[in-house]
């Protein structure tokens, strides 16, 4: 039995690790699933952040794992992306859904960040150059669309390269190759890693490598 407290919990089950799998919510002491109507990257971002798996990788419209059972607690979940918990997102009401079945259980793939790397290249030292990120074993770049000093600040801090001195686009440090992992990132400058900034999803972009972004950090400028 329970004695009050917030009667809601969140978990991902039947995935490869605690940061992927079928979305399950515990409401009123009962675990249930979330229907995938209207499922979005914003909802996935909220879930990943809530579970301490801050990188939203993808939002499968159905759980890649086996179908769930029991109650379907949420449907038509609509998040802005900045909610602190999934149940702060709008939905149809608890236990209310439009004839969903467990074949429509929503799934999430986050990253715990342990398989991610970042580096700066072609800048003459480790603290300046083109931004490259290793994700799923492949090095790729970041598009310069809407890139600004807040993004640069996150990168410099993450790489322990001091503060951001400048940022550049238009492949100022040469064109990279491979995937373009990020486009239209939204950072406030306080994130602990670039992939914790709000984004559209890994590999989602409308760019080419002529738009690869770069930065110069204070420790890199000192070495120039």
């Amino acid at each position: 039995s329970s004695l009050g407290g917030t009667d809601k919990e969140l978990r991902l089950v039947d995935g490869e690790n605690k940061c992927s799998g079928r979305v399950e919510v515990k409401v009123q002491e009962e675990w249930g699933t979330v229907c995938n109507n209207g499922w979005s990257m914003e909802a996935v971002s909220v879930i990943c952040n809530q579970l301490g798996c801050p990188t939203a990788i993808k939002a499968p419209g159905w759980a890649n794992s086996s179908a769930g059972s029991g109650r379907i607690w949420m449907d038509h979940v609509s998040c802005r992306g900045n909610e602190s918990a999934l149940w702060d997102c709008k939905h149809d009401g608890w236990g209310k859904h439009s004839n969903c079945t467990h074949q429509q259980d929503a799934g999430v793939t986050c990253s715990d960040g342990s398989n991610l790397e970042m580096r700066l290249t072609r800048g003459g030292n480790m603290c300046s150059g083109r931004i490259e990120i290793k994700f799923q074993g492949r090095w790729g770049t970041v598009c310069d669309d809407n890139f600004n000093i807040d993004h640069a600040s996150v990168i410099c801090r993450q790489l322990e390269c001091g503060s951001a001195v400048s940022f550049s686009g238009s492949s100022n440090f040469g064109e990279g190759s491979g995937p373009i992992w990020f486009d239209d990132l939204i950072c406030n400058g306080n994130e602990s890693a670039l992939w914790n900034c709000k984004h559209q999803g890994w590999g989602k972009h409308n760019c080419d490598h002529a738009e690869d972004a770069g930065v110069i950090c204070s420790k890199g400028a000192d070495l120039s």
Epitope: S1, G4, G95
Partner: antibody, heavy 116, light 107 residues
């Protein structure tokens, strides 16, 4: 359709235990829903007391601490409220209420007076 | 526990009037607010759940709105049969708590 009917003693002496029964018709209490007790004090203030789920899990209002117990008899399709060490402050109309999550279905209520 | 502060306590209106009742939560309850109607001598009945969703069979003159801490319940055109006490209630966290009620009287 779900129908709920409360029954109880009407009058209880202070320090005694209160036992109320909710008889459910038209629906099995093991099929679905949370089966709640809610009381309404004179002056109309409502207080959620606790529930027992269709699977038998219970949850209680912390304000009632260790005084409350909700149980059920599935063979009779009934669930019960026991409240120990009652005082005059427990005088109220007691409702049994059910629903998936929301308080959809209400009984008519039974009035309890605590008095010596 | 989350405290739900409901205003006003009493409303005296004429048939045909528009009525608004407000409920303020002591902390954010997201969209998780329900509204109930209790007619004299009856048990409460669910009118609105999840801020704005009308329960089955509830007339469309009853509406709800709000988010976070501030919520509103409106009867667009009051009818004589709407004489009742109206309660808000938060569904966000346990224990679920109710407002103190608004008694609606018809002139």
């Amino acid at each position: 359709d779900v129908q709920l009917q409360e029954s109880g003693p009407g009058l209880v002496k202070p320090s005694q235990s209160l036992s109320l029964t909710c008889t459910v018709t038209g629906y099995s209490i093991t099929s679905d829903y949370a089966w709640n007790w809610i009381r309404q004090f004179p002056g109309n203030k409502l207080e959620w007391m606790g529930f027992i789920s269709y699977s038998g899990i219970t949850s209680y209002n912390p304000s009632l601490k260790s005084r409350i117990s909700i149980t059920r008899d599935t063979s009779k399709n009934q669930f019960f409220l026991q409240l120990n060490s009652v005082t005059t402050e427990d005088s109220a109309t007691y409702y049994c209420v059910s629903g998936t999550y929301y308080f959809d279905y209400w009984g008519q209520g039974t009035t309890l007076t605590v008095s010596s | 526990s989350i405290v739900m502060t409901q205003t006003p306590k009493f409303l005296l209106v004429s048939a045909g009037d528009r009525v608004t009742i407000t409920c303020k939560a002591s902390q954010s309850v997201s969209h998780d607010v329900s509204w109930f109607q209790q007619k004299p001598g009856q048990s409460p009945k669910l009118l609105i759940y999840y801020t704005s969703n009308r329960y089955t069979g509830v007339p469309d003159r009853f509406t709800g709105s709000g988010y976070g801490t501030d919520f509103t319940f409106t009867i667009s055109t009051v009818q004589a049969e709407d004489l009742a006490i109206y309660f808000c209630q938060q569904d966000y966290s346990s224990p679920r708590t109710f407002g103190g009620g608004t008694k609606l009287e018809i002139k």
